[in-house]
């Protein structure tokens, strides 16, 4: 049986059940290389409390559909008096990056995971030439996830004192220049994740090979190498390589630009101080507030919730968007869709789509950006579920009793962007984490 998601095959992936202190290793095409789980384990569970290992999915006992992968085992489990077998179930959804498997829940018999990934899309529009896993768990099993830094088109400019060269990078995947209208970036070779431009020439100085690594809990490392043979004439016989070290800052701060810290014989060392390198619980909440010692800040957007069936309305040319954030009030136009953001076509108001659901909510504060994300909306033709990204800005003089109002700023590939100026986005900082 052919591997259902070949682009995910090259790596062993990790997921964590934080509540029970369990680490899962997952290899969807072969077996994980963990002796304690046996030679054919595709999903290996490591219980850190009891220091035991169990195979909860066998690579030989795999069944797959386009959106579901199940690994059975021969181990019996007793659930409500019936004789079941232990199994793992991975539900796949279309995403814009390779993404990460997320542990959902476990019963006595079934371990459930969900994975939003380009590999599950109906169309190839989000697929990279080359992409590597862009997250890691530290020794305390806390997740560090750089997926939000991945650019689907374009690149980041590395801060470098050399006026004659420009070094462009992407994070965990190659640079897509197809949308570029003709700048220096356009000359970058396909597949490169680190592109050096000198004059009118562009050179591949690194492609992603291995996934993100953790060196300390506040430092993550990504390495790019130039795969193809043939040395560049300005590298003194050395093969180019790029090392990007992502550093979690010691206290809350605005984002910084990636900086070139060392350069020798086409070996480039880059340091990027960014809160995305911090563990995810420091940056994110499933509710509409971020507070407490863990987050170093106090943010509470719950006063923005609308009651009594009213919604915020944002005009988007062809569409009207109805928003009801930080609550579970149904938007009348999007009846029964559990939508936090509802898209209605102006020319045909019967065309209604959920652009993100209220139970699929993430509040993120990172690098000075406060963002509320609603995902899991109605599918687009690519298979990607519509989502909305609301960028909040502090405005102590916002109208509407300080609440302000959301402004639609655009759509890219079924992701809808809004900005929202409100006094409730004014962040109160605590001290060190």
């Amino acid at each position: 049986q052919a591997a259902p998601f070949p682009e995910l095959c090259s790596y062993t992936w990790e997921a964590v059940d934080t509540k029970n202190n369990v680490l899962y290793k997952i290899n969807i095409c072969g077996s994980v290389d963990i002796v304690q789980c046996g030679p054919s384990s595709a999903v290996c569970m490591h219980d850190l409390k009891t220091r035991t290992y169990h195979s909860v999915g066998d690579s030989v006992l795999r069944s797959a559909t386009r959106s579901l992968l199940e690994f059975n085992t021969t181990v019996s489990c007793d659930q409500q008096g019936t004789n079941h077998r232990v199994q793992s179930s991975i539900a796949f959804l279309c995403g814009k990056t390779l993404g990460t498997p997320e542990f959902v829940t476990a019963t006595e018999c079934v371990h459930y995971f969900e994975w939003r990934t380009t590999a599950a899309c109906k169309k190839d529009i989000f697929k990279a030439n080359k992409e590597v896993p862009c997250y890691v768990f530290d020794e305390e099993l806390r997740k560090h996830d750089l997926n939000p830094l991945i650019k689907l088109s374009g690149a980041y400019l590395v801060d470098d004192s050399d006026p004659d060269t420009s070094l462009f990078i992407n994070v965990c995947r190659d640079i897509d220049t197809l949308r570029d209208p003709g700048s220096q970036l356009r000359a970058c070779p396909p597949g490169t994740a680190a592109c050096l431009v000198r004059g009118h020439q562009a050179f591949d100085v690194g492609q992603p090979r291995d996934g993100l690594k953790v060196v300390r809990k506040d430092r993550l490392v990504l390495s790019y190498v130039r795969e193809e043979a043939g040395k560049l004439d300005f590298c003194d016989g050395h093969s180019p390589a790029v090392t990007i070290t992502f550093v979690c800052p010691s206290e809350r701060r605005e984002g910084t630009i990636p900086k070139l810290t060392a350069k020798s014989n086409c070996r480039y060392e880059i340091e990027w101080i960014t809160e995305y390198a911090c563990h995810r619980d420091y940056l994110e909440s499933k509710t509409c507030s971020l507070s407490g010692e863990q987050q170093d800040v106090s943010i509470d957007l719950t006063p923005l919730a609308q009651s009594g069936g009213s919604s915020y309305i944002s005009d988007g040319k062809e569409y009207l968007f109805y928003l009801n954030v930080c609550g579970e009030t149904e938007i009348q136009f999007c009846n029964k869709k559990q939508a936090a953001v509802c898209q209605v076509k102006k020319s045909d108001t019967s065309q209604v789509k959920a652009a993100g659901r209220y139970h699929n909510q993430t509040l993120r504060y990172s690098d000075g950006d406060l963002t509320l994300i609603y995902f899991g909306g109605d599918e687009c033709s690519s298979g990607f579920q519509r989502m909305s990204v609301i960028n909040f800005r502090c405005n102590k003089t916002a109208g509407n009793d300080g609440k302000g109002t959301p402004v639609f700023t655009g759509e890219v590939d079924c992701t809808y962007f809004f900005t929202w100026d409100t006094e409730y986005a004014c962040v109160h900082h605590h001290h060190h984490h």
């Epitope: 650019k151 088109s153 374009g154 690149a155 980041y156 400019l157 801060d159 420009s166 462009f168 220049t177 949308r179 570029d180 209208p181 003709g182 700048s183 220096q184 970036l185 356009r186 630009i257 990636p258 950006d369 963002t371 990204v389 960028n391 800005r393 700023t409 655009g410 759509e411 890219v412 962007f417 900005t419």
Partner: nanobody
Framework: QVQLQESGGGLVQAGGSLRLSCEAS????????WGWFRQAPGKEREFVAA????????SYADSVKGRFTISRDNAKNTIYLQMNSLKPEDTAVYYC????????????????WGQGTQVTVSS
């Protein structure tokens, strides 16, 4: 390819104000970072201000901080540069440009350019 068309330039006295507009058409407005640049006679093109498309974060050249404001109206596919407290040294042709590179103020990283609009500040 994005097509850009600037307007709003003109002759103004020192201390006065102007608002430049740049209308974009063609390929998706939303995937770009937008910048304003200027070029005075006999000088190189220099960065004035930029706005990131995803978060609307802005950056400015030191020489215009506190006087100029970049903004955008996505409904109209238009970028603006509000220029207050103008000085004679602000005299230049002002260009609007689009880039898919983050964190850049380098004109060579901007691939689409308008034709420019002349701003003259008299003393």
């Amino acid at each position: 390819q994005v097509q850009l068309q600037e307007s709003g330039g003109g002759l103004v006295q020192a201390g006065g104000s102007l608002r430049l507009s740049c209308e974009a058409s063609g390929r998706t407005f939303n995937t770009y970072n937008w910048g304003w640049f200027r070029q005075a006679p006999g000088k190189e093109r220099e960065f004035v201000a930029a706005i990131r498309w995803s978060s609307s974060k802005t950056s400015y050249a030191d020489s215009v901080k506190g006087r100029f404001t970049i903004s955008r109206d996505n409904a109209k596919n238009t970028i603006y540069l509000q220029m207050n407290s103008l000085k004679p040294e602000d005299t230049a042709v002002y260009y609007c440009a689009a880039s898919i590179v983050d964190f850049t103020t380098n004109p060579s990283h901007f691939g689409s350019w308008g034709q420019g609009t002349q701003v003259t500040v008299s003393s």
